[in-house]
C-alpha cells in the first residue's frame, strides 16, 4: 500500500473550426496520479484511440488521430484517453501512449464503476504523466469527442492521500 496523489483537472470543451472561441471550463479534483507517474502538471487535447473497438489500446498497433498545428504536420500537445481493461496492463497502455507521442495518458475506469478511481501501478511506464479518472467523466469526454467537440485537459498535482492498495490492470 502506498500514498496516492489526486489530480486537479481543468477541462475545456470547444467546437473546432467554427470561428467561435468560447470555451466552457470545468475545474474538479476527480483524478488520481498513477503510482509510477511523474508528479507533474501536463496539458493537451484529449485523443482516444482510432476505431470503436480500440478504446482499451491493448493492440500494439493502435493509432491515435492527433490534431496538428495549422499548416503543419507538427502534432499539438495531446493526452491519450484510454479505457481501463481489455486484457492488458496499465503499463502497456501508458507505454503505447508514450510511443505514439502523447504528453500524458488519461485512463478512465471500467463501465459500471461510476466515479470510482483506483491507484494504478505501472512499473516501467514512467516517461509521461498518467492519471485515472472515473468512468462517468471519461465516457462524457469520449462522447463529446465522438460528436466532434475538441476537449482539452489541464492536469495539476492535487493532494496526497493514502495509503491505498495498488492495481496493475
Amino acid at each position: 500500500a502506498e500514498a496516492v496523489w489526486t489530480a486537479y483537472l481543468n477541462v475545456s470543451w470547444r467546437v473546432p473550426h467554427t470561428g467561435v472561441n468560447r470555451t466552457v471550463w470545468e475545474l474538479s479534483e476527480e483524478g488520481v496520479y498513477g503510482q509510477d507517474s511523474p508528479l507533474e502538471p501536463v496539458a493537451g487535447v484529449l485523443v482516444p484511440p482510432d476505431g470503436p473497438g480500440a478504446l482499451n489500446a491493448c493492440n500494439p498497433h493502435t493509432n491515435f488521430t492527433v490534431p496538428t498545428v495549422w499548416g503543419s504536420t507538427v502534432q499539438v500537445s495531446w493526452l491519450a484517453l484510454i479505457q481501463r481493461g481489455g486484457g492488458c496492463t496499465f503499463a502497456d497502455k501508458i507505454h503505447l501512449a508514450y510511443e505514439r507521442g502523447a504528453s500524458g495518458a488519461v485512463i478512465f475506469n471500467f463501465p459500471g464503476t461510476r466515479n470510482e478511481v483506483i491507484p494504478m501501478s505501472h512499473p516501467g511506464a514512467v516517461d509521461i504523466v498518467a492519471i485515472m479518472i472515473g468512468n462517468l467523466k471519461g465516457t462524457k469526454i469520449l462522447q463529446s469527442i465522438q460528436r466532434g467537440i475538441q476537449v482539452t485537459m489541464v492536469i495539476e498535482v492535487g493532494k496526497k492521500h493514502g495509503p491505498w492498495v495498488n492495481h496493475y490492470s
Epitope: 473546432p16 467561435v20 499539438v76
Partner: nanobody, 118 residues
Framework: QVQLQESGGGLVQAGGSLRLSCAAS????????MGWYRQAPGKEREFVAA???????YYADSVKGRFTISRDNAKNTVYLQMNSLKPEDTAVYYC????????????WGQGTQVTVSS
C-alpha cells in the same frame, strides 16, 4: 479584430542571428496561441514555430535547435530568436495569432523580410 505588427527583420550573414517581434492589438487573450510562418520566393507559406497557452512550444524540424519562440502575455507580444541562420532561411516571416486553438486558421501580420546572405 486582431492587428499584428512584426519587426526585427533585415539582412544578416549566414551564421548570424536576428530577433523578430510581433505585437498584437485588439481582441487577443493570453489563452490564444501565437506563431510564426514564413514564405520564400516561389514557395508556399510554411510553419516555423508556435507557442500555445501554457507556454508549450512547437517547431518545424528545419528550425529545431536554432530558433526559439517565446511570448510576453503582458505585452501581447511574441518573439522569434533566430540563431545560426542559413541562406535557406531567407523568406518573409509572418506573425500569426490562432483564432481559437493551434489547429485553427490564424490571423496574419503583414510580414517582415529576412535575408540571409552566404
Amino acid at each position: 479584430q486582431v492587428q499584428l505588427q512584426e519587426s526585427g527583420g533585415g539582412l544578416v550573414q549566414a551564421g548570424g542571428s536576428l530577433r523578430l517581434s510581433c505585437a498584437a492589438s485588439g481582441s487577443i487573450s493570453g489563452g490564444k496561441g501565437m506563431g510564426w510562418y514564413r514564405q520564400a520566393p516561389g514557395k508556399e507559406r510554411e510553419f516555423v514555430a508556435a507557442i500555445g497557452s501554457g507556454a508549450i512550444t512547437y517547431y518545424a524540424d528545419s528550425v529545431k535547435g536554432r530558433f526559439t519562440i517565446s511570448r510576453d502575455n503582458a505585452k501581447n507580444t511574441v518573439y522569434l530568436q533566430m540563431n545560426s541562420l542559413k541562406p535557406e532561411d531567407t523568406a518573409v516571416y509572418y506573425c500569426a495569432v490562432y483564432t481559437t486553438a493551434l489547429d485553427e486558421y490564424p490571423y496574419w501580420g503583414q510580414g517582415t523580410q529576412v535575408t540571409v546572405s552566404s
